[in-house]
């Protein structure tokens, strides 16, 4: 049955009414309003914006809108003692210094409180030494350096280009390699698309532009001082030495003008292959140290940032459900930005604002959703997903019993080519069905569905005629809901053409140039892509909150479980002798997946046939669907990552942004040929297969007939 069967519904109060109420012009207006000044987490400006959003959501008609505050560890540069990097000669004189700030964009010259580029949570320090260029500082880059090139980073300052993986993983890898400092820079190969001008004349990164960002390795912990528990008024805080995920070496980001000055002098080994070369006119020598004439010169970092416990504010709005008020569908995105937040996050926050306004309009006309909808404007996402994680920690008992779904709403755009969706397999069919009903905004697809343009531009690698939907990784506010609590989650945004644009993210990401004008002039002048994203996110929330039977298809989980089991088995089979020697078998996992497939199929048949007018049976079936994602949670968590508890998905240990399937087995197998104690290593593989097989079987049994 369709959504229009929800309570107090008149024919016009259906999904169409909700979608028709969404207006591109409003999103544009909200984006402008949210981007005129910086809204850095922990600042007065961001508190004022929280209060503004609270007030407007109340006006829009939500039942209640509250601020939820927490006192968490944040990081700021020292205003009187700026961070910079220098080249020093043999006498210790600074012969070159990197810039202290980005040149402000036109029209913003007089804006105060623009935080200069910095790596949040870097410790203080002034290390000096020889430079080693480490490419993207990925695990495989350090393998290449250490194992193949025999280059030792111990006691060196490393310089790494941004891109490919989360910056925190780069720093962790550098620390493990023994580096004493890290310089991060944006290479034009990754942040300057050919044929496009630099901002303000285009959407490319100018040479003075710099990407800010945190460099934590929290692994889902939230506030570094209160892992597992909310940072409330009576919190017990760890000492800074015991804080979770803080880097131990100084780190600082620079733009490509400054990077040129450091890299042009590099000597030592040549780059191992072309994949280590960017687009600057430098040799990309690996080092260590500078070439002949400059060999006595060193690099020195000057980092004076401080970590401070600071108050942050989430805005939580409630639209009470008429039939199942104790079932929560959550739409959340962050509000804090590094500077103006033209894309990240305000292109998402503006969409959430318009979705709230549309729901509020329907509510004012007498409609209510079947289930409760919670709207969230999260704080301190940029400092490690802190606002969302602290709120989820505070409300974990309610969420694990009542959470139906979480839809994330950070940046609505990272390009204007096609849709990008990452979600739980439970939502595949919801996304497919919804996008078939929405109009494509794309040129050349007038009168065609969004599903059609999306499928054409981003086809599934496995199933012809279907679009690509990716695994959830992390690096955004869905993390605690999905990876820790096991609440079905999804995210959608408009993206670039990954095949033709090889740069990482979008060029102006986390720079001062991420302005309203960037969006309005270059990405989405008509705000049609924003509107489409609003329709996708809002439509998903509408269906999840309003459909009589939850729009989850457990059979899609069965399909991916088989795919993931095949994949991890094939990785293990790269070690056929060890599989025999240590009696490693995947039979239990494949058996569990087979059982899951059969039980899911039977459940789906029952779902078609049961009496939906019986509220007890309806609730029972919906609860089985709601709790299926929860069933994949292992209360003990993954090895050394207790807050990543989902057995099927976790953020990659090598790139927080990417999702990994069967992460416990994957990590146990990773680089296993380099484990000195193979008996122990293969024992851990066997244990992880056991955990995965048990979890899949246990999840399957939650779908069995209850008696």
């Amino acid at each position: 049955k369709s959504s229009n069967e929800a309570t107090n519904i008149t024919p016009k109060h259906n999904m169409k009414a909700f979608l028709d109420e969404l207006k591109a012009e409003n999103i544009k207006k909200f984006l402008y309003n949210f981007t005129q000044i910086p809204h850095l987490a922990g600042t007065e400006q961001n508190f004022q914006l929280a209060k503004q959003i609270q007030s407007q959501w109340k006006e829009f008609g939500l039942d209640s809108v509250e601020l939820a505050h927490y006192d968490v560890l944040l990081s700021y540069p020292n205003k009187t003692h700026p961070n910079y990097i220098s080249i020093i000669n043999e006498d210790g004189n600074e012969i070159f210094n990197t810039s202290l700030f980005e040149p402000p964009p036109p029209g913003y010259e007089n804006v105060s409180d623009i935080v200069p580029p910095f790596s949040a949570f870097s410790p203080q320090g002034m290390p000096e030494g020889d430079l080693v260029y480490v490419n993207y500082a990925r695990t495989e880059d350090f393998f290449k350096l250490e194992r193949d090139m025999k280059i030792n980073c111990s006691g060196k300052i490393v310089i790494a280009r941004y891109g490919k993986v989360f910056r925190g993983n780069k720093v962790k890898n550098a620390q493990l390699a023994g580096a004493k400092g890290v310089i991060l820079y944006s290479d034009p190969a990754d942040y300057f698309a050919p044929g496009v001008k630099s901002y303000p004349d285009g959407w490319n990164l100018p040479g003075g532009g710099v990407q800010r960002g945190n460099i934590l390795n929290l692994n889902g912990a939230g506030d570094p001082l209160t892992p597992g528990y909310p940072a409330n008024e009576y919190a017990y805080r760890r000492g800074i030495a015991e804080a979770v995920g803080l880097p131990s070496i100084p780190v600082h980001p620079i733009g490509y003008y400054d990077a040129q000055k450091l890299l042009e002098k590099m000597g030592g080994s040549a780059p191992p292959d072309s994949s280590w070369r960017g687009s600057l006119k430098v040799p990309y020598n690996v080092g260590p140290g500078f070439t002949g004439n400059f060999s006595t010169q060193k690099v020195k970092m000057h980092i004076h940032s401080t970590n401070e416990v600071t108050r942050i504010y989430n805005v939580i709005g409630t639209l009470r459900g008429a039939v199942e008020p104790d079932r929560y569908v959550i739409l959340g995105g962050h509000r804090d930005s590094w500077v103006f937040g033209g894309i990240d996050p305000q292109s998402g926050a503006a969409v959430v604002h318009e979705i709230v306004r549309s729901f509020g309009t329907l509510k004012k006309e007498g409609w209510r959703p079947r289930r409760t909808i919670l709207f969230a404007s999260w704080d301190a996402e940029e400092f490690g997903l802190l606002g969302s994680t602290e709120w989820a920690e505070e409300n974990s008992r309610l969420l694990q019993e009542r959470g139906v779904a979480y839809i994330n709403a950070d940046s609505s755009i990272e390009g204007n080519y096609t849709l990008r969706v990452d979600c739980t397999p439970l939502m595949y069919s919801l996304v497919h069905n919804l996008t078939k009903e929405l109009k494509s905004p794309d040129e050349g697809f007038e009168g065609k569905s969004l599903y059609e343009s999306w499928t054409k531009k981003s086809p599934s690698p496995e199933f012809s005629g279907m679009p690509r939907i990716s695994k959830l990784g992390s690096g955004n506010d869905f993390e605690v809901f999905f990876q820790r609590l096991g609440i079905a989650s999804g995210r959608a945004r408009y993206t670039k053409n990954w095949e033709t644009n090889k740069f990482s993210g979008y060029p102006l990401y986390h720079s001062v140039y991420e302005t309203y004008e960037l969006v309005e002039k270059f990405y989405d002048p008509m705000f049609k892509y924003h509107l489409t994203v609003a329709q996708v996110r809002g439509g998903m929330v509408f269906e999840l909150a309003n459909s009589i039977v939850l729009p989850f298809d457990c059979r899609d989980y069965a399909v991916v479980l088989r795919k993931y089991a095949d994949k991890i088995y094939s990785i293990s089979m790269k070690h056929p002798q060890e599989m025999k020697t240590y009696s490693v078998s995947f039979d239990s996992l494949f058996s569990a997946v087979k059982n899951f497939t059969e039980i899911a199929s039977k459940f789906s048949e029952r779902l078609q046939d049961f009496d939906k007018s019986n509220p007890i049976v309806l609730r029972m079936m919906n609860d089985q669907l709601m709790f299926l994602e929860r069933a994949f949670i292992d209360p003990l968590g993954l090895p050394d990552r207790p807050f990543y508890r989902h057995v099927i998905y976790a953020p990659s240990s090598h790139n927080k942004y990417a999702g990994e399937s069967f992460p416990g087995i994957y990590d146990a197998l990773f680089d296993i040929e380099s484990k000195v104690d193979p008996s122990k290593a293969w024992g851990e593989v066997k244990r992880q297969i056991y955990v995965a097989a048990f979890t899949v079987q246990a999840a399957a049994e939650t779908l069995s007939e209850v008696a």
Epitope: K150, G178, H575, Q577, S674, V676
Partner: antibody, heavy 117, light 108 residues
């Protein structure tokens, strides 16, 4: 069971040649660095040579460079040490080993090479 | 090349005693230090890697410690089968792989 079995040792005249073999079982040979280590009578352990999993790189102790050649045949799970221009000081028990991060975690039983002058 | 120096070169002890063998590197090797045990006529066996990690199956009476240049192998409560020669080896800067000269542990 994971094991390495050396063969090919024996008595040889100074200036002569010998080829040692090492057969691996119980592990996926082509994934691992391999090494030869020797131990002179009543002496300590001395690294001789090692070779990359794909055979494209090898390294030698200075005293054997130009005389010894380490090689491997991954299809046969076998490691070799071709020794030429042998000297009395090359007399030793030669062990083949599996190396992980330059730690030798599996050793063969050894094969004795005696060079008579 | 990094030189490894073991001390003592030999020592005598009784069953039940605790003994400590030290190994010094000529330069810092972080924790890239491994210990092997060799019995007469047999191949060496790995006991401890990266200074303090005990290989599976090695009794817990063996322990390693140290970092930088100074390392120790301790056997707490000698068993009869522990009388053997012990070698340290650095795996920090390679090639070459270098070993200590060995410490022979005899029954008193």
């Amino acid at each position: 069971e994971v094991q390495l079995v050396e063969s090919g040792g024996g008595l040889v005249q100074s200036g002569g040649s010998l080829r040692l073999s090492c057969e691996a079982s119980g592990f996926t040979f082509s994934n691992y660095w391999m090494t030869w280590i020797r131990q002179g009578p009543g002496k300590g352990l001395e690294w001789v040579a090692n070779i990359k999993p794909d055979g494209t790189e090898n390294y030698y102790v200075d005293s054997v460079k130009g005389r010894f050649t380490i090689s491997r045949d991954n299809a046969r799970n076998s490691l070799y040490l071709q020794m030429t221009s042998l000297k009395a000081e090359d007399t030793a028990v030669y062990y083949c080993g599996r190396m992980i991060q330059f730690v030798i975690n599996i050793w063969g039983q050894g094969t004795l090479v005696t060079v008579s002058s | 090349d990094i030189q490894m120096t073991q001390s003592p070169s030999s020592l005598s002890a009784s069953v039940g005693d605790s003994v400590t063998i030290t190994c010094r590197a000529s330069q810092s090797i972080n924790n890239y230090l491994n210990w092997y045990q060799q019995k007469p006529g047999k191949a060496p066996k790995l006991l401890i890697y990266t200074a303090s990690s005990l290989l599976s199956g090695v009794p817990s009476r063996f322990s390693g410690s140290g970092s930088g240049t100074d390392f120790t192998l301790t056997i707490s409560g000698l068993h009869p089968e522990d009388f053997a020669t012990y070698f340290c080896q650095q795996s920090f800067s390679t090639p070459p792989i270098t070993f200590g000269q060995g410490t022979r542990l005899d029954i008193k």
